[in-house]
């Protein structure tokens, strides 16, 4: 048996991220003998479920089964049949379902109940579907990126796994942007916190971490846009909204009922003398930026320092990974490079937003118009949120790394969630074993 590797015992796990705008299924795998090591779990597949987020199925719950079928069947194909029964399946729903629960706990429970029944029909070890808290979403995103960057490893390497990895053990902060909420999570310099609600303590691999986290519900990119529209239509003189966040020449009719459907626009709701209004784009970054800033209340802060809306935010510390929609939007706009300064990003946004809609449609012919039309707003919103909301500066901008994947695994909360629920992150540093499964015998 000289030079013959022992057969690897591989384990799998499945996490469904039921987001506000869509659901994605992630399949992870790892060598069973190394499950307490750091950095051994990696993503083998992402399956994006066709259709909107699960909260949209509230009136058609009997279709949730067919909605999830293709991705669940894909998991059945990818994972060896012999492993099906021991493969855990978790579904975590985020801010879209938090908002539905705010409107009706009964409806949210009904959706989750049907999701659970649908997922129980598959041969996997279904572990439940639940709405995770904003704190969990922030914490698990932070765990994911630092796990994948090797920040929890006690072994110092002479090489870097990823371009922006430094060999120190300083953790990265996590910036997550979804459709309905956004999270900021990092280890501040000062261990004492003024706001216990925003404090988390972890012991991971023998080291203590005091982490700050906050999730801003209604400040994901889609809900922020609804908020902005609801705010701006209040002062419109008629059913035409001249909007600087959309390209010149862009036109779209919006139903007032759609605008006021979300709890996020309640604070701006008023009786309007029309049922519909038309957005007419004028494409002006500076004016768009000013309009977005009005969503952040910075006039009130009961702490030494706040982000916005009276929420405590300690001074920023270290490098940050910005993922999910932070990455998707900035990647589309070609602004993820480490070399692009904040000033250059602003300049590029000004240029992009001012481009006529017909020109934009021609330049990006393959992109769905609904998404294409919103990149000017989304890019402006990201800049406003990072600079005015979280107080990044032109100098600290270079500490933001826009990350899609790390080592082939998507940055996001799902991996951290699974690592936690499968007890794969030990509190203490595991003792290194003399022989690992890959040792030749």
């Amino acid at each position: 048996t000289q030079n013959k590797a022992l057969p690897e015992n591989i384990k799998y796990g499945i996490v469904l991220d039921a987001g506000s705008s869509h659901t994605s299924l992630y399949i992870y795998k790892w060598p069973a003998e190394k499950e307490n090591d750091t950095g051994v779990v990696h993503q083998v597949e992402e399956c994006r479920v066709k259709g909107p987020g699960i909260s949209k199925y509230v009136q058609k719950v009997n279709e949730i089964g067919i909605y999830l079928t293709d991705c669940m069947e894909r998991a059945r194909e990818v994972i060896p049949r012999s492993q099906h029964q021991e493969t855990p399946v978790y579904l975590g729903a985020t801010a879209g379902m938090r908002l539905l629960r705010m409107e009706s706990e009964e409806l949210a429970d009904r959706v989750l109940d049907v999701v659970e029944r649908s997922l129980s029909n598959y041969p996997f070890d279904f572990q439940g579907a639940r709405i995770i808290t904003g704190q969990e979403e922030g914490a698990y995103g932070w765990i994911t990126i630092n796990y994948l960057l090797g920040k929890f490893s006690q072994k110092t390497r002479w090489f870097s796994i990823v371009p922006y990895e430094t060999n120190n053990q300083e953790t990265f902060g996590a910036l997550d942007l979804g459709g309905a909420s956004t999270q900021i999570t990092f280890v501040p310099q000062n261990q004492t916190t003024e706001s216990p609600d925003n404090a988390l303590q972890f012991r991971l691999y023998g080291k203590d971490y005091n982490v700050y986290t906050h999730s801003f519900l209604c400040y994901g990119k889609d809900q922020a846009l609804w908020q902005k529209l609801a705010k701006d239509i209040q002062v419109a003189s008629n059913e035409i909204l001249r909007d600087p966040c959309f390209h010149p020449g862009y036109k779209k009719v919006v139903n007032v009922s759609d605008l006021y459907k979300t709890p996020c626009t309640k604070r701006f709701e008023m009786t309007l003398p029309f049922q519909q209004f038309e957005i007419q784009g004028i494409g002006n970054y500076q004016q768009c930026h000013q309009s977005v800033l009005e969503l952040f209340n910075t006039s009130y802060c009961p702490y030494s320092q706040c982000a916005f809306n009276g929420i405590f935010l300690p001074p920023l510390q270290g490098d940050f990974g910005a993922f999910s929609a932070f990455y998707f939007v900035m990647n589309f706009l070609n602004l993820t490079s480490e070399k692009v300064s904040q000033e250059k990003v602003t300049e590029m946004m000004k240029k992009f937003c001012s481009q006529p809609w017909e020109e934009i449609k021609t330049s990006y012919a393959g992109v769905k118009e609904k998404y294409l039309s919103e990149y000017c707003f989304s890019g402006t919103y990201i800049l406003s949120l990072l600079l005015q909301g979280y107080h990044f500066t032109a100098d600290s901008w270079e500490h933001i790394h826009f990350i899609g994947k790390i080592q082939g695994s998507d940055a996001g909360w799902t991996l951290g969630y699974m690592l936690n629920l499968t007890n794969m992150i030990p509190a203490e540093q595991p003792l290194s074993t003399p022989l690992s499964h890959s040792t030749y015998v």
Partner: nanobody
Framework: EVQLLESGGGLVQPGGSLRLSCAAS????????MSWYRQAPGKGLELVAA???????NYADSVKGRFTISRDNSKNTVYLQMNSLRAEDTAVYYC??????????????????WGQGTQVTVSS
């Protein structure tokens, strides 16, 4: 526009079988999901079985193990094989073809087409 034409309904004894067909014509590239719904007298619409573009299926608990949905993409036709029929399966059966919208505003379905329905009666 997509047109859906159902056939294969009729009168059958309990324990018997029927095969319903639904032929789609027109602008069918936009269709991903096809399904059979039914409406019993005095009741609401009930989703019986559905099939995705990839051929994956889903069934109502009441018909699992008795009914089979299948799809022949070359003929643009979806079938519902109904075995071990019971009196409670009596209904008008409708073929439905649709695709979901990816957007969080407006309707859930981007396209939504329905057939005229075919009557299935299970009686001795």
């Amino acid at each position: 526009e997509v047109q859906l034409l159902e056939s294969g309904g009729g009168l059958v004894q309990p324990g018997g079988s029927l095969r319903l067909s639904c032929a789609a014509s027109g602008d069918i590239f936009s269709i991903n999901y096809m399904s059979w719904y039914r409406q019993a007298p005095g009741k609401g619409l009930e989703l019986v079985a559905a099939i995705t573009g990839r051929g994956n299926t889903n069934y109502a608990d009441s018909v699992k193990g008795r009914f089979t949905i299948s799809r022949d993409n070359s003929k643009n036709t979806v079938y519902l094989q109904m075995n071990s029929l019971r009196a409670e399966d009596t209904a008008v059966y409708y073929c439905n073809a649709w695709d979901y919208s990816d957007y969080d505003e407006g309707p859930l379905r981007e396209y939504d087409y329905w057939g005229q329905g075919t009557q299935v009666t299970v009686s001795s």
